[in-house]
Amino acid sequence: SQVSQNCHNGSYEISVLMMGNSAFAEPLKNLEDAVNEGLEIVRGRLQNAGLNVTVNATFMYSDGLIHNSGDCRSSTCEGLDLLRKISNAQRMGCVLIGPSCTYSTFQMYLDTELSYPMISAGSFGLSCDYKETLTRLMSPARKLMYFLVNFWKTNDLPFKTYSWSTSYVYKNGTETEDCFWYLNALEASVSYFSHELGFKVVLRQDKEFQDILMDHNRKSNVIIMCGGPEFLYKLKGDRAVAEDIVIILVDLFNDQYFEDNVTAPDYMKNVLVLTLSPGNSLLNSSFSRNLSPTKRDFALAYLNGILLFGHMLKIFLENGENITTPKFAHAFRNLTFEGYDGPVTLDDWGDVDSTMVLLYTSVDTKKYKVLLTYDTHVNKTYPVDMSPTFTWKNSKLPNDITGRGPQ
């Protein structure tokens, strides 16, 4: 049913869903701080633009009585319950920030006639792609998939002279929310990744993964997994690995690789790490100091959600346009706005674009080094290190199938 929005006469409210089930186990206080920081900046920007309006946030808390798993498994109904709470209280703002779980976002989008924008820090799954009034401020699975296909096909770089068409995917069901949906997208038989690969097998058991490392009859040399170095070590330990194995470790929201004093452990030498460029993100700052890397990005996405709303509000007010219209709800895409750390670009479907970075471990320095970058906005790879000091033979990435000649 239609809910009246607190979104007119110079007073604009943001509804922030504070769900017990969240993509990351972030203390709600940190999210509140991020939202309040964003609000202050928005107020300043509007004031500087000569717009004398009020912008506030209403935090909508789940009672946590029924949906108390703390992760995304029981989030489907929690999101709808919170919407019902908003509806009963007649307290809908101009925009809804949250939820972060793919299940809840999908269900809320499906079960409501949304004439207002939804901004999500999360909602990584393919089922949340191409939603007209949904904006996602953390890299969704589709972006990862497009990178992987692009990289697999690349064969004209000094360090990658073979196109790849095969892969193993390790997915054991204990992944974090982001990893769960990233790997889910790679596993899905109808996904772009599956469509473009000739061979793909999902490894679900630790032993399957461990056996592949030295199996002479393996069908691919490439294994994709998701998590941090510690996760890989638990699985791989110090086991011997065939020299032409390449492990792609997806660890998008972890900044630790860029810290000055970090040395790559020996077990990372066969690994390429895919992460996000730290960009302007300042590691030496209190905003990130007390949060683990992934969580830092989560709070940052909430903050950027507030700044995005402020950006759109400013544009519409300056143009004398109404905020409670489908036009406003559909406007949160195909744009660049001033985020907390600098410009943030959203694609045609409201998904954040970013620079992904592929790192390798230098056998000389034992440091993580940038091999290449990938701009998700233009789907293009840019080589950085033309003569990497790889562990692989001739400082080139091996073919994906042992014994197969140049492609």
């Epitope: 202050e40 302007n280 700052s285 209190s286 907390y340």
Partner: nanobody, 124 residues
Framework: QVQFVESGGGLVQAGGSLRLSCTAS????????MGWFRQAPGKEREFVAA????????DFADSVKGRFTISRDRAKNTVYLQMNSLKPEDTAVYYC?????????????????WGQGTQVTVSS
Amino acid sequence: QVQFVESGGGLVQAGGSLRLSCTASGGIFSNYGMGWFRQAPGKEREFVAAISGGGVYTDFADSVKGRFTISRDRAKNTVYLQMNSLKPEDTAVYYCARARTARLTSRRHDYDYWGQGTQVTVSS
């Protein structure tokens, strides 16, 4: 052109207090983190305190923690550094600076606009 003017410096006895102000003109103030740095004669310019664009996050050098506080007033385009329990080693020229983004930062090269500085002298 963005300009910052510091004020509030002076001579004070050890254990005393001062409040430094940094007022901005010619630029959008609240989009940016702000910081205070200081430079004693013959020494490198060092970080003292910082505040984020929205004022929610603050950071301090270990040497001033618990003695100094930083705040900002959006309406007045001003950042304040309240300095209590001053020590002779706090003697320096204090500079305010604007960060390139709204984020809090203690790294000097993340700041692009600087004030002229105000002298603080703490006598024993």
